[in-house]
Protein backbone atom coordinates (compact mmCIF):
# COMPACT_ATOMS: atom_id res chain seq x y z
CA UNK A 1 0.00 0.00 0.00
CA UNK A 2 1.27 3.36 -0.93
CA UNK A 3 0.16 6.47 0.97
CA UNK A 4 0.69 10.05 -0.05
CA UNK A 5 1.22 12.31 2.97
CA UNK A 6 0.88 16.04 2.51
CA UNK A 7 1.85 18.19 5.47
CA UNK A 8 0.08 21.51 5.67
CA UNK A 9 0.77 24.54 7.80
CA UNK A 10 -1.41 24.70 10.91
CA UNK A 11 -3.86 27.55 11.04
CA UNK A 12 -2.71 30.15 13.59
CA UNK A 13 -4.27 33.29 14.96
CA UNK A 14 -1.44 35.76 14.89
CA UNK A 15 -3.35 38.64 16.47
CA UNK A 16 -6.53 37.83 18.29
CA UNK A 17 -9.21 40.18 19.62
CA UNK A 18 -8.36 42.00 22.85
CA UNK A 19 -10.58 42.16 25.92
CA UNK A 20 -11.89 45.66 26.38
CA UNK A 21 -14.10 47.89 28.50
CA UNK A 22 -16.35 50.28 26.56
CA UNK A 23 -19.00 52.88 27.40
CA UNK A 24 -22.66 52.26 26.73
CA UNK A 25 -23.72 53.82 23.45
CA UNK A 26 -20.24 53.73 21.97
CA UNK A 27 -18.92 51.20 19.44
CA UNK A 28 -16.18 48.60 19.70
CA UNK A 29 -13.95 47.08 17.04
CA UNK A 30 -12.42 43.64 17.46
CA UNK A 31 -9.68 42.62 15.02
CA UNK A 32 -8.41 39.18 14.17
CA UNK A 33 -5.44 38.22 12.00
CA UNK A 34 -4.61 34.60 11.14
CA UNK A 35 -2.11 32.69 9.03
CA UNK A 36 -3.31 29.80 6.85
CA UNK A 37 -1.68 27.24 4.65
CA UNK A 38 -1.88 28.88 1.23
CA UNK A 39 -3.24 25.74 -0.36
CA UNK A 40 -6.25 25.60 1.90
CA UNK A 41 -9.53 27.58 1.81
CA UNK A 42 -9.32 30.05 4.76
CA UNK A 43 -12.25 31.30 6.80
CA UNK A 44 -12.57 33.83 9.65
CA UNK A 45 -15.87 34.01 11.45
CA UNK A 46 -17.09 35.63 14.66
CA UNK A 47 -19.11 34.27 17.54
CA UNK A 48 -20.69 36.14 20.41
CA UNK A 49 -21.50 34.23 23.56
CA UNK A 50 -21.71 31.01 21.55
CA UNK A 51 -23.84 32.20 18.65
CA UNK A 52 -22.65 32.75 15.14
CA UNK A 53 -22.61 36.44 14.20
CA UNK A 54 -21.82 35.90 10.56
CA UNK A 55 -25.38 36.18 9.29
CA UNK A 56 -25.85 39.39 11.32
CA UNK A 57 -22.90 41.04 9.68
CA UNK A 58 -24.98 43.35 7.52
CA UNK A 59 -27.28 44.54 10.33
CA UNK A 60 -27.17 47.97 11.95
CA UNK A 61 -25.72 46.37 15.05
CA UNK A 62 -22.84 44.27 13.64
CA UNK A 63 -20.40 44.96 10.80
CA UNK A 64 -17.98 42.20 9.77
CA UNK A 65 -15.29 42.67 7.15
CA UNK A 66 -11.62 41.72 6.63
CA UNK A 67 -11.15 40.14 10.01
CA UNK A 68 -12.91 42.99 11.81
CA UNK A 69 -16.02 42.84 13.97
CA UNK A 70 -17.61 46.21 14.72
CA UNK A 71 -20.47 46.37 17.25
CA UNK A 72 -22.44 49.61 17.21
CA UNK A 73 -24.56 51.31 19.92
CA UNK A 74 -23.27 49.20 22.75
CA UNK A 75 -25.73 48.21 25.43
CA UNK A 76 -25.28 46.20 28.59
CA UNK A 77 -26.80 43.16 26.88
CA UNK A 78 -23.86 43.22 24.46
CA UNK A 79 -21.29 42.41 27.11
CA UNK A 80 -19.84 38.90 27.14
CA UNK A 81 -17.28 36.80 25.27
CA UNK A 82 -16.54 37.35 21.60
CA UNK A 83 -14.50 34.78 19.60
CA UNK A 84 -12.63 34.98 16.39
CA UNK A 85 -12.77 31.55 14.71
CA UNK A 86 -10.10 30.89 12.06
CA UNK A 87 -10.67 27.64 10.14
CA UNK A 88 -9.83 25.58 7.13
CA UNK A 89 -11.22 22.24 6.04
CA UNK A 90 -8.48 20.68 8.16
CA UNK A 91 -8.43 22.64 11.42
CA UNK A 92 -10.12 25.25 13.58
CA UNK A 93 -8.57 27.72 16.06
CA UNK A 94 -10.36 30.19 18.26
CA UNK A 95 -9.29 33.32 20.16
CA UNK A 96 -11.61 34.79 22.74
CA UNK A 97 -11.95 38.32 24.20
CA UNK A 98 -14.24 39.68 26.86
CA UNK A 99 -16.32 42.82 26.33
CA UNK A 100 -17.44 44.74 29.41
CA UNK A 101 -19.94 47.56 28.84
CA UNK A 102 -19.84 50.33 31.43
CA UNK A 103 -21.96 53.40 32.03
CA UNK A 104 -24.08 55.29 34.49
CA UNK A 105 -26.09 53.14 36.91
CA UNK A 106 -29.46 51.63 36.23
CA UNK A 107 -32.59 53.03 37.82
CA UNK A 108 -33.17 52.59 41.53
CA UNK A 109 -35.89 49.92 41.27
CA UNK A 110 -37.86 50.60 44.44
CA UNK A 111 -38.35 53.38 46.96
CA UNK A 112 -40.15 53.14 50.30
CA UNK A 113 -41.00 55.74 52.95
CA UNK A 114 -41.10 54.67 56.58
CA UNK A 115 -41.13 56.18 60.08
CA UNK A 116 -44.00 58.40 58.91
CA UNK A 117 -44.74 59.21 62.57
CA UNK A 118 -41.58 61.34 62.45
CA UNK A 119 -43.31 63.74 60.03
CA UNK A 120 -44.56 65.64 63.08
CA UNK A 121 -40.88 66.41 63.72
CA UNK A 122 -40.34 67.13 60.01
CA UNK A 123 -38.41 63.91 59.41
CA UNK A 124 -38.94 60.78 57.35
CA UNK A 125 -36.95 57.65 56.51
CA UNK A 126 -36.34 56.83 52.86
CA UNK A 127 -35.15 53.34 51.83
CA UNK A 128 -34.44 51.99 48.37
CA UNK A 129 -33.21 48.90 46.54
CA UNK A 130 -29.70 49.15 45.08
CA UNK A 131 -29.37 50.11 41.44
CA UNK A 132 -27.39 48.08 38.89
CA UNK A 133 -23.87 49.52 38.96
CA UNK A 134 -23.16 48.72 35.28
CA UNK A 135 -19.59 47.68 36.06
CA UNK A 136 -18.60 50.92 37.79
CA UNK A 137 -19.13 51.15 41.56
CA UNK A 138 -21.99 53.37 42.71
CA UNK A 139 -20.35 56.32 44.42
CA UNK A 140 -23.47 57.96 45.86
CA UNK A 141 -27.23 58.16 45.82
CA UNK A 142 -28.92 61.53 45.30
CA UNK A 143 -32.22 62.04 47.12
CA UNK A 144 -34.46 64.64 45.48
CA UNK A 145 -37.92 66.02 46.13
CA UNK A 146 -40.66 67.76 44.18
CA UNK A 147 -43.53 69.82 45.58
CA UNK A 148 -46.38 69.40 43.11
CA UNK A 149 -48.33 72.23 44.76
CA UNK A 150 -45.66 74.92 44.69
CA UNK A 151 -43.25 73.92 41.92
CA UNK A 152 -44.47 71.00 39.81
CA UNK A 153 -41.88 69.25 37.63
CA UNK A 154 -38.98 70.89 39.51
CA UNK A 155 -36.74 68.57 41.49
CA UNK A 156 -34.52 69.77 44.32
CA UNK A 157 -31.71 67.76 45.87
CA UNK A 158 -32.04 67.06 49.58
CA UNK A 159 -28.54 65.61 49.73
CA UNK A 160 -26.38 62.70 48.70
CA UNK A 161 -25.42 59.56 50.64
CA UNK A 162 -22.57 57.08 50.03
CA UNK A 163 -23.15 54.41 47.40
CA UNK A 164 -23.09 51.57 49.91
CA UNK A 165 -26.07 53.04 51.76
CA UNK A 166 -29.67 52.15 50.89
CA UNK A 167 -31.58 54.23 53.44
CA UNK A 168 -31.39 57.55 55.21
CA UNK A 169 -33.44 59.69 57.57
CA UNK A 170 -34.16 63.08 56.03
CA UNK A 171 -34.58 66.39 57.84
CA UNK A 172 -37.46 68.14 56.10
CA UNK A 173 -38.79 71.67 55.99
CA UNK A 174 -42.19 72.53 57.46
CA UNK A 175 -45.20 72.68 55.15
CA UNK A 176 -43.79 71.10 52.02
CA UNK A 177 -45.65 68.54 49.92
CA UNK A 178 -42.79 66.10 49.47
CA UNK A 179 -42.59 63.53 46.69
CA UNK A 180 -39.21 61.80 46.68
CA UNK A 181 -37.05 60.02 44.13
CA UNK A 182 -33.55 58.56 44.37
CA UNK A 183 -30.88 58.45 41.68
CA UNK A 184 -27.68 56.36 41.72
CA UNK A 185 -24.45 58.04 40.58
CA UNK A 186 -21.16 56.48 39.52
CA UNK A 187 -18.12 57.87 37.72
CA UNK A 188 -20.07 57.87 34.46
CA UNK A 189 -22.82 60.07 35.88
CA UNK A 190 -26.35 59.70 37.24
CA UNK A 191 -28.67 56.90 36.26
CA UNK A 192 -32.39 57.04 35.72
CA UNK A 193 -34.27 58.09 38.87
CA UNK A 194 -36.41 55.71 40.86
CA UNK A 195 -40.18 55.68 40.59
CA UNK A 196 -41.53 58.51 42.74
CA UNK A 197 -42.67 57.92 46.29
CA UNK A 198 -46.04 58.66 47.80
CA UNK A 199 -46.54 62.32 48.75
CA UNK A 200 -46.20 63.37 52.38
CA UNK A 201 -46.87 66.81 53.87
CA UNK A 202 -44.92 68.20 56.80
CA UNK A 203 -46.75 70.28 59.42
CA UNK A 204 -46.72 74.08 59.34
CA UNK A 205 -44.34 76.10 61.52
CA UNK A 206 -43.29 79.71 62.02
CA UNK A 207 -40.69 80.96 59.53
CA UNK A 208 -37.10 80.12 60.40
CA UNK A 209 -35.62 82.74 58.08
CA UNK A 210 -36.14 86.39 57.28
CA UNK A 211 -35.75 88.10 53.92
CA UNK A 212 -32.27 89.21 52.86
CA UNK A 213 -30.98 92.13 50.78
CA UNK A 214 -33.13 94.65 52.63
CA UNK A 215 -32.70 98.13 51.14
CA UNK A 216 -34.29 101.51 51.64
CA UNK A 217 -33.94 104.33 49.13
CA UNK A 218 -36.14 107.13 47.93
CA UNK A 219 -37.39 107.47 44.39
CA UNK A 220 -39.02 110.79 45.27
CA UNK A 221 -37.92 113.54 47.62
CA UNK A 222 -40.53 112.64 50.26
CA UNK A 223 -40.55 108.86 50.22
CA UNK A 224 -38.50 105.78 50.92
CA UNK A 225 -39.00 102.55 49.02
CA UNK A 226 -38.12 99.52 51.15
CA UNK A 227 -37.32 96.39 49.15
CA UNK A 228 -36.02 92.91 49.98
CA UNK A 229 -35.49 89.52 48.44
CA UNK A 230 -38.62 87.51 49.20
CA UNK A 231 -38.40 84.15 50.93
CA UNK A 232 -38.30 81.11 48.64
CA UNK A 233 -41.52 79.10 48.92
CA UNK A 234 -39.71 76.25 50.65
CA UNK A 235 -38.87 78.67 53.49
CA UNK A 236 -42.46 79.88 53.98
CA UNK A 237 -43.22 76.97 56.35
CA UNK A 238 -46.93 77.57 55.73
CA UNK A 239 -49.30 78.13 52.80
CA UNK A 240 -48.48 81.84 52.72
CA UNK A 241 -45.86 84.21 54.00
CA UNK A 242 -46.13 87.91 54.71
CA UNK A 243 -43.62 90.55 55.71
CA UNK A 244 -43.64 92.74 58.79
CA UNK A 245 -41.78 95.89 57.75
CA UNK A 246 -40.63 98.28 60.51
CA UNK A 247 -38.92 101.62 60.19
CA UNK A 248 -37.95 104.65 62.26
CA UNK A 249 -35.54 107.56 61.82
CA UNK A 250 -32.03 106.55 62.82
CA UNK A 251 -30.98 107.76 66.24
CA UNK A 252 -34.47 108.07 67.67
CA UNK A 253 -35.37 105.76 70.50
CA UNK A 254 -39.07 106.07 69.75
CA UNK A 255 -41.38 103.26 68.67
CA UNK A 256 -41.09 101.67 65.25
CA UNK A 257 -43.77 102.25 62.65
CA UNK A 258 -44.71 99.13 60.72
CA UNK A 259 -46.87 97.66 58.04
CA UNK A 260 -47.64 94.08 57.06
CA UNK A 261 -47.41 93.42 53.35
CA UNK A 262 -47.33 90.41 51.05
CA UNK A 263 -45.51 92.03 48.13
CA UNK A 264 -41.71 92.33 48.46
CA UNK A 265 -41.69 96.12 48.75
CA UNK A 266 -43.23 98.96 50.72
CA UNK A 267 -43.38 102.65 49.89
CA UNK A 268 -43.12 104.83 53.00
CA UNK A 269 -44.57 108.26 52.23
CA UNK A 270 -44.17 111.68 53.85
CA UNK A 271 -40.53 111.26 54.81
CA UNK A 272 -38.14 114.15 55.31
CA UNK A 273 -35.54 114.63 52.57
CA UNK A 274 -32.48 112.35 52.69
CA UNK A 275 -32.90 111.11 56.24
CA UNK A 276 -31.35 107.83 57.41
CA UNK A 277 -33.87 105.27 58.64
CA UNK A 278 -33.46 102.06 60.57
CA UNK A 279 -35.34 99.27 58.78
CA UNK A 280 -36.29 95.73 59.78
CA UNK A 281 -38.13 93.14 57.68
CA UNK A 282 -39.46 90.01 59.33
CA UNK A 283 -41.23 87.02 57.79
CA UNK A 284 -44.67 86.24 59.23
CA UNK A 285 -46.98 83.31 58.56
CA UNK A 286 -50.06 81.75 60.10
CA UNK A 287 -47.91 80.01 62.72
CA UNK A 288 -45.91 83.00 63.88
CA UNK A 289 -42.93 85.18 63.09
CA UNK A 290 -39.41 84.62 61.88
CA UNK A 291 -36.38 85.36 64.06
CA UNK A 292 -35.73 88.90 65.30
CA UNK A 293 -34.52 90.66 62.14
CA UNK A 294 -31.31 92.61 61.72
CA UNK A 295 -31.44 96.38 61.33
CA UNK A 296 -30.54 97.87 57.94
CA UNK A 297 -29.98 101.56 57.27
CA UNK A 298 -31.89 103.10 54.38
CA UNK A 299 -32.34 106.66 53.16
CA UNK A 300 -35.34 108.67 52.12
CA UNK A 301 -35.32 110.56 48.82
CA UNK A 302 -32.83 113.26 47.95
CA UNK A 303 -33.49 116.74 46.61
CA UNK A 304 -31.51 119.21 44.50
CA UNK A 305 -29.25 121.59 46.45
CA UNK A 306 -30.95 124.84 47.43
Amino acid sequence: IMANLKVKDATQITQGPRSTIEKKGSRVTFTCQASFDPSLQPSITWRGDGRDLQELGDSDKYFIEDGRLVIHSLDYSDQGNYSCVASTELDVVESRAQLLVVGSPGPVPRLVLSDLHLLTQSQVRVSWSPAEDHNAPIEKYDIEFEDKEMAPEKWYSLGKVPGNQTSTTLKLSPYVHYTFRVTAINKYGPGEPSPVSETVVTPEAAPEKNPVDVKGEGNETTNMVITWKPLRWMDWNAPQVQYRVQWRPQGTRGPWQEQIVSDPFLVVSNTSTFVPYEIKVQAVNSQGKGPEPQVTIGYSGEDYPQ
Epitope: Q242, E258, Q259, I260, V261
Partner: antibody, heavy 119, light 107 residues
Framework: QVQLQESGPGLVKPSQTLSLTCTVT?????????WNWIRQFPGKGLEWMGY???????SYNPSLKSRVTISRDTSKNQFSLKLSSVTAADTAVYYC????????????WGQGTLVTVSS | DIQMTQSPSSLSASVGDRVTITCKAS??????VAWYQQKPGKAPKLLIY???YRYTGVPSRFSGSGSGTDFTFTISSLQPEDFATYYC?????????FGGGTKVEIK
Protein backbone atom coordinates in the same frame (compact mmCIF):
# COMPACT_ATOMS: atom_id res chain seq x y z
CA GLN B 1 -58.31 81.92 78.07
CA VAL B 2 -57.56 85.27 76.42
CA GLN B 3 -60.15 87.95 77.12
CA LEU B 4 -60.35 91.58 76.02
CA GLN B 5 -62.55 94.28 77.53
CA GLU B 6 -63.05 97.82 76.20
CA SER B 7 -63.76 100.72 78.51
CA GLY B 8 -64.23 104.46 78.09
CA PRO B 9 -66.88 107.14 77.74
CA GLY B 10 -69.90 106.33 75.60
CA LEU B 11 -70.46 109.97 74.61
CA VAL B 12 -67.90 112.37 73.17
CA LYS B 13 -68.44 115.91 71.96
CA PRO B 14 -67.50 116.86 68.39
CA SER B 15 -63.90 118.14 67.94
CA GLN B 16 -62.85 116.45 71.18
CA THR B 17 -60.64 113.37 71.56
CA LEU B 18 -62.16 109.93 71.91
CA SER B 19 -60.21 107.78 74.40
CA LEU B 20 -60.73 104.07 74.96
CA THR B 21 -58.78 101.42 76.85
CA CYS B 22 -58.63 97.68 76.28
CA THR B 23 -57.75 95.49 79.25
CA VAL B 24 -56.35 92.07 78.37
CA THR B 25 -56.48 89.08 80.67
CA UNK B 26 -55.09 85.61 80.14
CA UNK B 27 -52.20 86.73 77.94
CA UNK B 28 -49.41 89.31 78.16
CA UNK B 29 -49.58 91.95 75.45
CA UNK B 30 -45.75 91.99 75.37
CA UNK B 31 -45.48 88.28 74.53
CA UNK B 32 -46.68 88.24 70.93
CA UNK B 33 -49.31 89.29 68.39
CA UNK B 34 -50.82 92.57 67.30
CA TRP B 35 -53.36 94.36 69.48
CA ASN B 36 -55.89 96.07 67.27
CA TRP B 37 -58.69 98.59 67.30
CA ILE B 38 -61.58 98.00 64.88
CA ARG B 39 -64.80 99.95 64.68
CA GLN B 40 -68.22 99.16 63.28
CA PHE B 41 -70.39 101.95 62.00
CA PRO B 42 -74.15 102.01 62.52
CA GLY B 43 -74.56 100.82 58.91
CA LYS B 44 -72.61 97.71 59.98
CA GLY B 45 -69.41 98.37 57.99
CA LEU B 46 -66.17 97.37 59.74
CA GLU B 47 -63.00 99.48 59.68
CA TRP B 48 -59.58 98.50 60.97
CA MET B 49 -58.05 101.51 62.74
CA GLY B 50 -54.61 100.28 63.68
CA TYR B 51 -52.61 98.22 66.13
CA UNK B 52 -49.77 98.22 68.58
CA UNK B 53 -47.61 95.10 68.51
CA UNK B 54 -46.16 93.02 71.32
CA UNK B 55 -42.87 94.89 70.84
CA UNK B 56 -44.45 98.36 70.89
CA UNK B 57 -44.32 99.04 67.16
CA UNK B 58 -47.49 100.41 65.63
CA SER B 59 -49.44 100.54 62.39
CA TYR B 60 -52.32 102.91 61.65
CA ASN B 61 -54.93 103.10 58.93
CA PRO B 62 -53.89 105.98 56.61
CA SER B 63 -57.57 106.90 56.17
CA LEU B 64 -57.53 108.20 59.74
CA LYS B 65 -54.56 110.37 58.83
CA SER B 66 -52.88 111.67 61.93
CA ARG B 67 -55.97 111.54 64.14
CA VAL B 68 -55.24 108.12 65.64
CA THR B 69 -52.76 107.11 68.34
CA ILE B 70 -52.48 103.68 69.93
CA SER B 71 -50.38 103.27 73.05
CA ARG B 72 -49.99 100.71 75.81
CA ASP B 73 -49.45 100.36 79.53
CA THR B 74 -47.55 97.11 79.97
CA SER B 75 -47.77 97.22 83.76
CA LYS B 76 -51.57 97.03 83.52
CA ASN B 77 -51.61 94.81 80.41
CA GLN B 78 -53.69 97.45 78.62
CA PHE B 79 -53.57 99.21 75.29
CA SER B 80 -55.41 102.39 74.42
CA LEU B 81 -56.91 104.27 71.47
CA LYS B 82 -57.01 108.02 71.05
CA LEU B 83 -58.92 109.54 68.13
CA SER B 84 -58.74 113.31 67.91
CA SER B 85 -61.02 115.87 66.29
CA VAL B 86 -64.01 113.58 66.24
CA THR B 87 -67.18 114.23 64.30
CA ALA B 88 -70.56 112.51 64.17
CA ALA B 89 -69.09 110.22 61.47
CA ASP B 90 -66.94 108.63 64.19
CA THR B 91 -70.01 107.30 65.99
CA ALA B 92 -69.52 103.52 66.05
CA VAL B 93 -69.08 100.44 68.16
CA TYR B 94 -65.36 100.22 68.96
CA TYR B 95 -63.76 96.79 69.37
CA CYS B 96 -60.32 95.82 70.54
CA UNK B 97 -59.01 92.58 69.07
CA UNK B 98 -55.96 90.33 69.06
CA UNK B 99 -54.60 88.97 65.81
CA UNK B 100 -54.48 85.32 64.90
CA UNK B 101 -50.76 84.67 64.44
CA UNK B 102 -49.22 88.07 63.70
CA UNK B 103 -51.68 88.80 60.93
CA UNK B 104 -54.20 86.45 59.24
CA UNK B 105 -57.30 87.90 60.83
CA UNK B 106 -58.55 88.64 64.34
CA UNK B 107 -58.99 85.68 66.65
CA UNK B 108 -60.03 87.32 69.92
CA TRP B 109 -62.37 90.31 70.28
CA GLY B 110 -63.73 92.41 73.09
CA GLN B 111 -67.49 92.70 73.35
CA GLY B 112 -67.39 96.23 71.91
CA THR B 113 -68.36 99.60 73.27
CA LEU B 114 -70.65 102.09 71.59
CA VAL B 115 -69.25 105.59 71.32
CA THR B 116 -71.61 108.33 70.20
CA VAL B 117 -70.25 111.67 69.02
CA SER B 118 -72.82 114.33 69.76
CA SER B 119 -73.02 117.72 71.37
CA ASP C 1 -56.23 100.53 49.89
CA ILE C 2 -57.67 97.19 48.82
CA GLN C 3 -61.46 97.21 48.47
CA MET C 4 -63.44 94.08 49.29
CA THR C 5 -66.84 93.81 47.59
CA GLN C 6 -69.16 91.23 49.09
CA SER C 7 -72.33 89.81 47.56
CA PRO C 8 -75.15 89.41 48.08
CA SER C 9 -75.75 91.94 50.83
CA SER C 10 -78.51 89.69 52.18
CA LEU C 11 -80.09 86.35 51.43
CA SER C 12 -82.93 84.19 52.73
CA ALA C 13 -82.41 80.49 53.25
CA SER C 14 -83.86 77.52 55.10
CA VAL C 15 -82.25 75.11 57.53
CA GLY C 16 -80.36 72.46 55.55
CA ASP C 17 -79.75 74.74 52.57
CA ARG C 18 -76.34 75.22 51.00
CA VAL C 19 -75.38 78.89 51.22
CA THR C 20 -72.68 80.59 49.16
CA ILE C 21 -71.30 84.11 49.65
CA THR C 22 -68.74 85.72 47.37
CA CYS C 23 -66.12 88.37 47.94
CA LYS C 24 -64.16 90.20 45.26
CA ALA C 25 -60.91 92.04 45.97
CA SER C 26 -59.94 95.16 44.02
CA UNK C 27 -56.50 93.66 43.41
CA UNK C 28 -54.79 90.28 43.68
CA UNK C 29 -54.60 89.30 47.35
CA UNK C 30 -53.27 85.77 46.76
CA UNK C 31 -55.15 83.65 49.32
CA UNK C 32 -55.02 86.21 52.13
CA VAL C 33 -58.72 86.37 53.00
CA ALA C 34 -60.49 85.71 56.29
CA TRP C 35 -64.21 85.20 56.96
CA TYR C 36 -66.16 86.13 60.10
CA GLN C 37 -69.59 85.46 61.54
CA GLN C 38 -71.34 88.15 63.58
CA LYS C 39 -74.56 87.83 65.53
CA PRO C 40 -76.57 90.86 66.73
CA GLY C 41 -74.96 92.62 69.70
CA LYS C 42 -71.87 90.41 69.55
CA ALA C 43 -68.33 90.78 68.21
CA PRO C 44 -67.37 89.04 64.96
CA LYS C 45 -65.96 85.51 65.23
CA LEU C 46 -63.11 84.27 63.03
CA LEU C 47 -64.17 81.26 60.94
CA ILE C 48 -61.69 81.01 58.05
CA TYR C 49 -58.22 82.44 57.39
CA UNK C 50 -55.93 82.20 54.35
CA UNK C 51 -59.03 81.69 52.16
CA UNK C 52 -59.62 78.03 53.07
CA TYR C 53 -58.23 77.21 56.52
CA ARG C 54 -60.77 76.69 59.26
CA TYR C 55 -59.93 78.37 62.55
CA THR C 56 -59.78 76.19 65.67
CA GLY C 57 -63.14 74.74 66.68
CA VAL C 58 -65.02 75.89 63.59
CA PRO C 59 -67.45 73.23 62.30
CA SER C 60 -66.62 71.54 59.01
CA ARG C 61 -69.83 72.77 57.35
CA PHE C 62 -68.06 76.14 56.98
CA SER C 63 -65.56 76.29 54.14
CA GLY C 64 -63.77 78.85 52.02
CA SER C 65 -62.06 78.82 48.65
CA GLY C 66 -60.54 81.09 46.05
CA SER C 67 -57.36 82.97 45.31
CA GLY C 68 -56.35 86.11 43.48
CA THR C 69 -59.40 88.37 43.47
CA ASP C 70 -62.38 86.00 43.76
CA PHE C 71 -63.31 84.22 46.97
CA THR C 72 -66.22 82.08 48.09
CA PHE C 73 -67.54 81.21 51.54
CA THR C 74 -69.89 78.24 51.82
CA ILE C 75 -72.11 76.80 54.51
CA SER C 76 -72.82 73.26 53.27
CA SER C 77 -75.94 72.68 55.35
CA LEU C 78 -77.36 75.69 57.14
CA GLN C 79 -78.07 75.18 60.85
CA PRO C 80 -80.41 77.32 63.02
CA GLU C 81 -77.41 78.88 64.80
CA ASP C 82 -75.87 79.99 61.46
CA PHE C 83 -78.36 82.82 60.83
CA ALA C 84 -76.06 85.82 61.19
CA THR C 85 -74.07 88.36 59.20
CA TYR C 86 -70.86 87.21 57.50
CA TYR C 87 -67.89 89.39 56.58
CA CYS C 88 -64.80 88.83 54.46
CA UNK C 89 -61.51 90.59 55.25
CA UNK C 90 -58.24 90.79 53.34
CA UNK C 91 -55.10 90.20 55.37
CA UNK C 92 -52.81 90.64 52.37
CA UNK C 93 -51.49 94.01 53.48
CA UNK C 94 -52.24 96.82 55.91
CA UNK C 95 -54.53 98.68 56.04
CA UNK C 96 -56.65 95.57 56.48
CA UNK C 97 -60.09 95.99 54.97
CA PHE C 98 -63.47 94.26 55.26
CA GLY C 99 -66.31 93.49 52.89
CA GLY C 100 -69.68 95.12 53.48
CA GLY C 101 -71.24 91.99 54.97
CA THR C 102 -73.92 89.46 53.98
CA LYS C 103 -76.93 88.99 56.23
CA VAL C 104 -78.24 85.41 56.17
CA GLU C 105 -81.92 85.43 57.20
CA ILE C 106 -84.53 82.73 57.73
CA LYS C 107 -86.76 82.18 54.72
Amino acid sequence: QVQLQESGPGLVKPSQTLSLTCTVTGYSITSDYTWNWIRQFPGKGLEWMGYISYSGSYSYNPSLKSRVTISRDTSKNQFSLKLSSVTAADTAVYYCARSFSYSYGFAYWGQGTLVTVSS
Amino acid sequence: DIQMTQSPSSLSASVGDRVTITCKASQDVSSAVAWYQQKPGKAPKLLIYSASYRYTGVPSRFSGSGSGTDFTFTISSLQPEDFATYYCQQHYSTPWTFGGGTKVEIK
